[in-house]
Interface confidence: low
Amino acid sequence: QNLFTKDVTVIEGEVATISCQVNKSDDSVIQLLNPNRQTIYFRDFRPLKDSRFQLLNFSSSELKVSLTNVSISDEGRYFCQLYTDPPQESYTTITVLVPPRNLMIDIQKDTAVEGEEIEVNCTAMASKPATTIRWFKGNTELKGKSEVEEWSDMYTVTSQLMLKVHKEDDGVPVICQVEHPAVTGNLQTQRYLEVQYKPQVHIQMTYPLQGLTREGDALELTCEAIGKPQPVMVTWVRVDDEMPQHAVLSGPNLFINNLNKTDNGTYRCEASNIVGKAHSDYMLYVYDPPTTIPPPTTTTTTTTTTTTTILTIITDSRAGEEGSIRAVDH
């Protein structure tokens, strides 16, 4: 046997090169036949009415043909025949790779609620061989479940991803990435998750800055509520008691002027949206006011000026205990 060929792998739509090579040439006729055993070339003559076949080289030792715009129907065995005595035959197999025609990502719900499990499907249609589908949530790879369907040597792969969503997933892309021998680089499609979650409530003490609340002082608390959708209601209540009459509510802010001991208690900021409600508690303890101890008075007889030195001692009735800022989120 001195007739040689090489198998060819080509991407659909591209160019395949078929070569029939003769080691020891004796000027015998070389013929190339298609999978239906129709003659494509007989020496340098093409009887087949398919202009996609073009002669690249013809000699006694080689018949080289190009096939442009390769389609899946071109796949199969191409036969080289050498009319020696006896005749020799060798075949080359053309394998056509078909990249997925369409990459579709289908998310079960446009908007999900935190804690909910949603189904995301990605379909890579009509590829050959079957496509490998990989899933990513942001940069994290996830495991999907693939189902392959075959028709006429073409494969449609559908991968299903069951995804439990958390509030941190809001705005994060779910990426369906394709791996296929006919695809160079990254072929992917993505959908951004929209996750609704109940509010997170946080109370900030904006006055006094040093955090010590004393009788006669003012108190200002700001309630920060973050959720999706943005909380529609932010309300202040006093737990187990009425709100002081001198308390002023302004949107997310609570002002209490001229604090006194009767203001002691737990103040709750409540926020809600369509997903749920949450609250944060602030425990107010009003400390005693600063106490003043009068110092001795020094009088100088040589002048009419009296110098009074005032020694101020700030006493804390809860000295040694922890500070007064107590916020508890729920």
Epitope: D106, T123, A126, E147, V148, E149, E150, W151, T156
Partner: antibody
């Protein structure tokens, strides 16, 4: 030769049950999504139900949901349609069809089996 | 649930071109499949997707789609093309499939 042959049709009273079968041959049955499509006398085609190659996913038209159950036996190359609580409007010629790319196109059809629901 | 709308009937002289249309919201997203059904016979797939004609279907059958409308064109209709033609598509994002009401093509 690729072939689908339906059986199991017949006359049944309203509220009754019937099981249709579809025997497949000439292709790798487990690789294809399969469907049932019906045609009432003198009317158009109506998709009834579909099942994935593995049998793991099933799909139904609203008109039969809860009453009909599609299933398949890949070892015997057979598709089934179990029909309960049959109504007069279920009277039709029931076709079994092979799905191409899921159910986006049905490229092989059987000749159908007739279901008549009547007193 | 969506629906696919087809003209009930259309006539064409032999050798002339006939265009069958199919309208529906699902066609904004999906290419339809087209089926030919002759009396007392099972449907036959004649065209599907963007440009797919099953083997054995004459090349006088072609399809196109734009917006929510899809068309099947028979260029040079033959007597054997006298049949009912149905379009079919997936129903939006639901796992349901729709058929149009069918168009009866009469080749005169």
């Amino acid at each position: 030769e690729v072939q689908l042959v339906e059986s199991g049709g017949g006359l049944v009273q309203p509220g009754g049950s019937l099981r249709l079968s579809c025997a497949a041959s000439g292709f790798t049955f487990r690789s294809y999504t399969m469907s049932w499509v019906r045609q009432a006398p003198g009317k158009g085609l109506e998709w009834v139900s579909g099942i994935s190659g593995s049998g793991g996913s099933t799909y139904y038209a609203d008109s039969v949901k809860g009453r009909f159950t599609i299933s398949r036996d890949n070892s015997n190359n057979t598709l089934y349609l179990q029909m309960h609580s049959l109504r007069a409007e279920d009277t039709a010629l029931y076709y079994c069809a092979r799905g191409l790319y899921g159910l986006y196109a049905m490229d092989v059809w059987g000749q159908g089996t007739t279901v008549t629901v009547s007193r | 649930s969506s629906e696919l709308t087809q003209d009930p009937a259309v006539s064409v002289a032999s050798g002339q071109t006939v265009r069958i249309t199919c309208q529906g919201d699902s066609l904004r997203h999906y290419y339809p499949s087209w089926y030919q059904q002759k009396p007392r016979q099972a449907p036959v797939l004649v065209f599907f997707g963007e440009n797919n004609r099953p083997s054995g279907i004459p090349d006088r059958f072609s399809g196109s789609a734009s917006g929510n409308t899809a068309s099947l064109t028979i260029a040079g209709a033959q007597a054997e093309d006298d049949a009912d033609y149905y379009c079919s598509s997936r129903d939006g994002n639901d796992d349901r499939w729709l058929f149009g009401g069918g168009t009866k093509v009469t080749v005169l």
